[in-house]
């Protein structure tokens, strides 16, 4: 089956959610770990990640179609310290499969706002820190 990983972001008020989504077959979930790294060009691993999610096979899901699993990393307030390059990754301990998502960046600007760039689904997100709006 085709396994892939995508990165996305959403904002709720001052909160920024960074989301890593892995698409996989139901039976492939066991032994899969999804993780998010910051400023790690070559050594992104569960051990060096900001957050990781170990997938479990859900017996409640019927059929053998493709399903998705999400890791969500929530930043309550983006600060200049969050500026950097992020990457969603995944690996399977059973099959040895390694997935690496596209690099995306958070840039905190001098105006006190921040932008998220490099996301595949929406190429450029700009967030106003004070207003809590997406423009």
């Amino acid at each position: 089956g085709c396994i892939n990983i995508t990165s996305s972001a959403s904002q709720e008020g001052t909160r920024l959610n960074l989301i890593c989504t892995v698409w996989h077959k139901k039976e492939e979930a066991e032994g899969f770990v999804v993780f998010l790294c910051k400023d790690r060009s070559g050594d992104c691993s569960p051990e060096t990640s900001l957050k990781q999610l170990r997938l479990k096979r859900d017996p409640g899901i019927d059929g053998v179609g493709e399903i998705s699993s999400q890791l969500m990393f929530t930043i309550s307030q983006v600060t200049p310290l969050h500026s950097g390059t992020y990457q969603c990754c995944a690996r399977s301990q059973k099959s040895g499969i390694r997935l690496q998502g596209h690099f995306f960046s958070i840039l905190f600007t001098e105006t006190g706002n921040y932008t998220v760039t490099g996301l595949k689904q929406r190429q450029h997100l700009e967030f106003s820190h004070n207003e809590g709006t997406l423009s």
């Epitope: 008020g13 001052t14 910051k38 400023d39 790690r40 051990e47 060096t48 990640s49 900001l50 990393f73 929530t74 930043i75 309550s76 307030q77 600060t79 200049p80 310290l81 969050h82 500026s83 950097g84 006190g112 820190h129």
Partner: antibody
Framework: EVQLVESGGGLVQPGRSLKLSCAAS????????MAWVRQAPTKGLEWVAS????????YYRDSVKGRFTISRDNAKNTQYLQMGSLRSEDTATYYC????????????WGQGASVTVSS | ETVLTQSPTTTPASPGEKVTITCRAS?????MHWYQQKSGASPKLWIY???KLASGVPNRFSGSGSGTSYSLTINNMEAEDAATYYC??????????FGPGTKLEIK
């Protein structure tokens, strides 16, 4: 449990320099932004400086800009605060602290290093 | 710069009493955090993101507030709660600011 151990404090004359070190252990140091927070005798807490996890971007309170330099060595799991042109008002206990990544708090604190600036 | 003021400066409380410490900001802030510091010890993170208790904090503590007014409440004061409590916030460009502290004493 996260461990942060400061060293390098002491008595120094006004105008002189001093370098504080903070040895970190029991966590993935290179993942965390770090900071220094100080507390003057019988006074409250005051943020001094912060440094980002990977890129090494640095931020300072206005009163120490140009005099203090925060740095880190991820290979040695250590952060530093080089303090120059010291003034009597810099007299304080300096705490090495970790930034919580998902919030704007300082979640782990060292035991503190005492710095006294006096002639 | 956003300035934080705390009240009261010092407050004595009896065991079992309900205690409320207030932190006011000179301009609206998104979250408030609280630290506990006992005499001769380092501060400890106590409450973060306005209302979340840090690991190991007894559930007699709670935090609330929004905008410019925030509070820390102890429902049944215990002797071990005697300490100085500091509020803290983040905003740009002043970054991290703390309140002056409230000293909570046991009667």
């Amino acid at each position: 449990e996260v461990q942060l151990v400061e060293s390098g404090g002491g008595l120094v004359q006004p105008g002189r320099s001093l370098k504080l070190s903070c040895a970190a252990s029991r966590f993935t140091f290179s993942n965390y932004a770090m900071a220094w927070v100080r507390q003057a005798p019988t006074k409250g807490l005051e943020w001094v400086a912060s440094i980002s996890s990977g890129a090494g971007n640095t931020y300072y309170r206005d009163s120490v800009k140009g005099r203090f330099t925060i740095s880190r060595d991820n290979a040695k799991n250590t952060q530093y605060l080089q303090m120059g042109s010291l003034r009597s008002e810099d007299t304080a206990t300096y705490y090495c602290v970790t930034h919580n990544y998902e919030s704007t708090v300082f979640d782990y604190w060292g035991q503190g290093a005492s710095v006294t600036v006096s002639s | 710069e956003t300035v934080l003021t705390q009240s009261p400066t010092t407050t004595p409380a009896s065991p079992g009493e309900k205690v409320t410490i207030t932190c006011r900001a000179s301009s609206s802030v998104s979250y408030m955090h609280w630290y506990q510091q006992k005499s001769g010890a380092s501060p400890k993170l106590w409450i973060y993101d306005t209302s979340k208790l840090a690991s190991g904090v007894p559930n007699r503590f709670s935090g609330s507030g929004s905008g410019t007014s925030y509070s820390l409440t102890i429902n049944n004061m215990e002797a071990e709660d005697a300490a100085t409590y500091y509020c803290q916030q983040w905003n740009y460009p002043s970054m991290y600011t703390f309140g002056p502290g409230t000293k909570l004493e046991i009667k």
